[in-house]
Amino acid sequence: DAHKSEVAHRFKDLGEENFKALVLIAFAQYLQQCPFEDHVKLVNEVTEFAKTCVADESAENCDKSLHTLFGDKLCTVATLRETYGEMADCCAKQEPERNECFLQHKDDNPNLPRLVRPEVDVMCTAFHDNEETFLKKYLYEIARRHPYFYAPELLFFAKRYKAAFTECCQAADKAACLLPKLDELRDEGKASSAKQRLKCASLQKFGERAFKAWAVARLSQRFPKAEFAEVSKLVTDLTKVHTECCHGDLLECADDRADLAKYICENQDSISSKLKECCEKPLLEKSHCIAEVENDEMPADLPSLAADFVESKDVCKNYAEAKDVFLGMFLYEYARRHPDYSVVLLLRLAKTYETTLEKCCAAADPHECYAKVFDEFKPLVEEPQNLIKQNCELFEQLGEYKFQNALLVRYTKKVPQVSTPTLVEVSRNLGKVGSKCCKHPEAKRMPCAEDYLSVVLNQLCVLHEKTPVSDRVTKCCTESLVNRRPCFSALEVDETYVPKEFNAETFTFHADICTLSEKERQIKKQTALVELVKHKPKATKEQLKAVMDDFAAFVEKCCKADDKETCFAEEGKKLVAASQAALGL
């Protein structure tokens, strides 16, 4: 599979349009502060160079690796040191160290302005005036804000973005047509970014073995009729795809993802009965569809797991011969029988099984030692089941906003050192588990909830890693990938925390809150709630609820007042005084 010119190979495989889009995404994910025009210029130069290599693969520099070509191009940016500081030092390194250096400087929370959506007519005019630039700008803005966004999937989002404008800009009511589509793309995009961020964290922080274990469990749930060898092949290929994308090798990643989709569709009879519709779609839709496909039905009459993994006299022999293969088979067999379990639970069970075999296969009577291993699984299964039952009960009682508030209080008490914006963002996302998962029947709740929580807690971990402030967060984030959620769940009040000084400015509100969207208004109130808990971590839930109810009434009252600003100033002082008295601040 060696090619004289890697850049020519990828250009030919992907086509010019996808090649340019992927190079733009790669550059924007590396140099997140660079202006759009600078990136377009760099992409055009790379594309022109690639074309010369397609024409003659022996032309000068065409034999260089993509990292060398792209890194050299990024290092031509004149303002590298003043814009990026120490990232400029990467350019003094040789490949592969230079690329590793760029990867380490990716910023999960770049200091970029919030994307403000222009008026629909303004957007439609821009779309019609220069469709290509309009779509490139979309790729650029998403990629620089989400430096680990799954690049081939971003191409799919861009395709849907284009389709939305194509359809809606000629509709009678442009806004009614376009805005819901853009909202959906935004929400799906954030979710997609967060899911991919967990895959990259899994690979980069816990290694290929951890990612492969995750993939075995998930693919076995999804394709329970597939043989273990088939699942293993898919896991190997999927691991390569995600390793490439997480490593910034976006051209290879997109190319390999297309190959994997092709393979799956050519072999769907031995993989899953649910793939037919997906495989009739064009490439980008096909890959997306396969990634989201529902679990196939479990084969009938699957034998008990105990026979091969507990009762057999060959357990230790089989384990010793090929440990990871045997554990992989255990995980495959357990996962295909349990679409009702979360992937992280399945991985905890496999880890427990591995630990037991490590201990027991060295014992005098191994069989006697591991005979009860499945009994150890019961508490591991019941823990997430109970937690989900309780939190869904609470969600149904409170509704999403107040459920988020309960989580805000819970997490602020656990890790009060974490910045208020991070606590608000993470707790709001944790709270969305209610509307996302609690509607499901029991059999679908756990995979929905716990695997979603893994994604959200990873957001907390990557944001915290940038500026670590809490040893407890670091501990839960780094000790075990699959035990992150139980680790955070088990945290109690941080008794070492010294309450924050009271600052009236934090609780001063102005008339501008009245013009905010409902979501933004909620965020303002939730920000105040976190600050309140940071000032008074011993406040009871009922005290906090009373203060929040008073606060909501205050905002509602002043937003109806004739002189809003005066109302906010005068009533605000009264509210702060009353809250201080109620909480003993």
């Epitope: 309780q390 939190n391 009960e393 009682q397 819970r410 656990k414 009871t540 839930k541 009922e542």
Partner: nanobody
Framework: HVQLVESGGGLVQTGGSLRLACAAS????????MGWFRQAPGKEREFVAS????????YYADSVKGRFTISRDNGKDTVYLQMNRLIPEDTAVYYC?????????????????WGQGTQVTVSS
């Protein structure tokens, strides 16, 4: 405020039984989840059992499952912990706690109101 008073502790032999009670006053008892926690000498306080506001859901620590039973009588504003087949490791001060959210989580941080505790000693 909710006031909680535990009773029923004492000295018992291994294999014996005790029934703890926790009487609540001050607020609508039936809106609170109730929990039992315990603290052995030199150890951290730990979850034992909890019950939601209606009494329809109960939760137990693995170490007491099958031996202890939590129940409540909303008419009497009281929660109970029936402890059977006691073992020396159950020796601790047992605390009753109330959670206004009414669900019955395992974490101490969810419980705003606590009793003073009652001593349970299991001798071998």
């Amino acid at each position: 405020h909710v006031q909680l008073v535990e009773s029923g502790g004492g000295l018992v032999q291994t294999g014996g039984s005790l029934r703890l009670a926790c009487a609540a006053s001050g607020r609508a008892f039936s809106t609170y989840a109730m929990g039992w926690f315990r603290q052995a000498p030199g150890k951290e306080r730990e979850f034992v059992a909890s019950i939601n506001r209606s009494g329809s859901s109960t939760y137990y620590a693995d170490s007491v499952k099958g031996r202890f039973t939590i129940s409540r009588d909303n008419g009497k504003d009281t929660v109970y912990l029936q402890m059977n087949r006691l073992i020396p490791e159950d020796t601790a001060v047992y605390y009753c706690a109330a959670d206004s959210e009414g669900v019955g989580f395992r974490n101490m941080l969810e419980y705003d109101y606590w009793g003073q505790g009652t001593q349970v000693t299991v001798s071998s």
